[in-house]
Amino acid sequence: EVEKTACPSGKKAREIDESLIFYKKWELEACVDAALLATQMDRVNAIPFTYEQLDVLKHKLDELYPQGYPESVIQHLGYLFLKMSPEDIRKWNVTSLETLKALLEVNKGHEMSPQVATLIDRFVKGRGQLDKDTLDTLTAFYPGYLCSLSPEELSSVPPSSIWAVRPQDLDTCDPRQLDVLYPKARLAFQNMNGSEYFVKIQSFLGGAPTEDLKALSQQNVSMDLATFMKLRTDAVLPLTVAEVQKLLGPHVEGLKAEERHRPVRDWILRQRQDDLDTLGLGLQGGIPNGYLVLDLSMQEALS
């Protein structure tokens, strides 16, 4: 912490400008009025202050606003944002998307820091839900953002926001997240025609139940193997060989290369070998002809 010292004669800052870069830390502390700094925060970013000098400026703002900075100051923090701790940010009330964008811009190209995560959390909580514009902004800066949210947090995402989601935004989502996102996507995209609908819904299918996969198999969608491999195992297991063949279309040949991996491996074990043979792919491991297939899930449901 900088010691309180009197400002030397003639050094009192009248405005925030380049001359301040020549001030020592103690001179900045003594000669820059915190209220002046707050009203001219937009100038700070254009001045090449050292990290030590930025520490002093932050200290002055902290003293002026012990309960947290107002949004008028936050919006113009620029690189001073990098000096903020998550504890500082928790005191803020950020409501403007422009403020959020301005601060995300400062961190652009870097991993999501604890500061940014806290900022986003404060912003989303302040808005009450993850609306489309916010989601648009966040996924533009952090494509993996959506998949960093818990299923509980995703539950507050309105279906209209799903339009902002690109396939790459879902790359790291797990089945529990897709569980929540898939029904929202169905609501959002249902008025599109068949082929357009499939293009949009494809990335979300890791949350689809068996019945929807059966329905898709009747629509000549030609699902690629990468999408098929991301489907829920429990949703794939009840599909018949004919249904998988229709679902994958020309991509069905790819099953051979994936026969040792889930969900293909587990699905093969549930099919009659005779049925698998009709694909002509040499898939092995099905139930031999003449064996009785017991549906244990049905037995459990009855007991």
């Epitope: 299923p151 279906p159 089945p175 529990r176 569980d179 929540v180 898939y182 029904p183 169905r186 609501l187 249902q190 949350g207 139940p209 019945e211 929807d212 059966k214 329905a215 829920r232 429990d234």
Partner: nanobody, 121 residues
């Protein structure tokens, strides 16, 4: 077209358990993607309480998680909410919600009309 109707006591004493049932008519709830509960305290916004998904996974609002249980009885076409150790802060209009259309070409979200639950001694 599904119709949802919440039922349960309108008045609950502090520290007791709030129990609500949502009865669905006009279709089978087996065709739903999820069954959930949402509430709106007087003068405040909507607050998601929790949902059970078709996959069997259950998700609860973290701030309520230790007190909430949601269950589904597809044979009765009902799902229910239990919220334990209630306080005056749990006074709200409670809505049940579901989204049907599993295996169908269209899907829709349906809400009950809501039931006011007051927590008071």
């Amino acid at each position: 077209q599904l119709q949802l109707q919440e039922s349960g006591p309108g008045l609950v004493k502090p520290s007791e358990t709030l129990s609500l049932t949502c009865t669905v008519s006009g279709g089978s709830i087996s065709n739903s993607y999820y069954w959930g509960w949402i509430r709106q305290p007087p003068g405040k916004g909507l607050e998601w309480i929790g949902s059970i998904y078709h996959s069997g996974n259950t998700y609860y609002n973290p701030s309520l998680k230790s007190r909430v249980t949601i269950s589904v009885d597809t044979s009765k076409n009902q799902f229910s909410l239990k919220l334990s150790s209630v306080t005056a802060a749990d006074t709200a209009v409670y809505y049940c919600v579901t989204q049907d259309g599993v295996g169908a070409t269209t899907t829709e979200e349906y809400w009950g009309q809501g039931t006011l639950v007051t927590v008071s001694s």
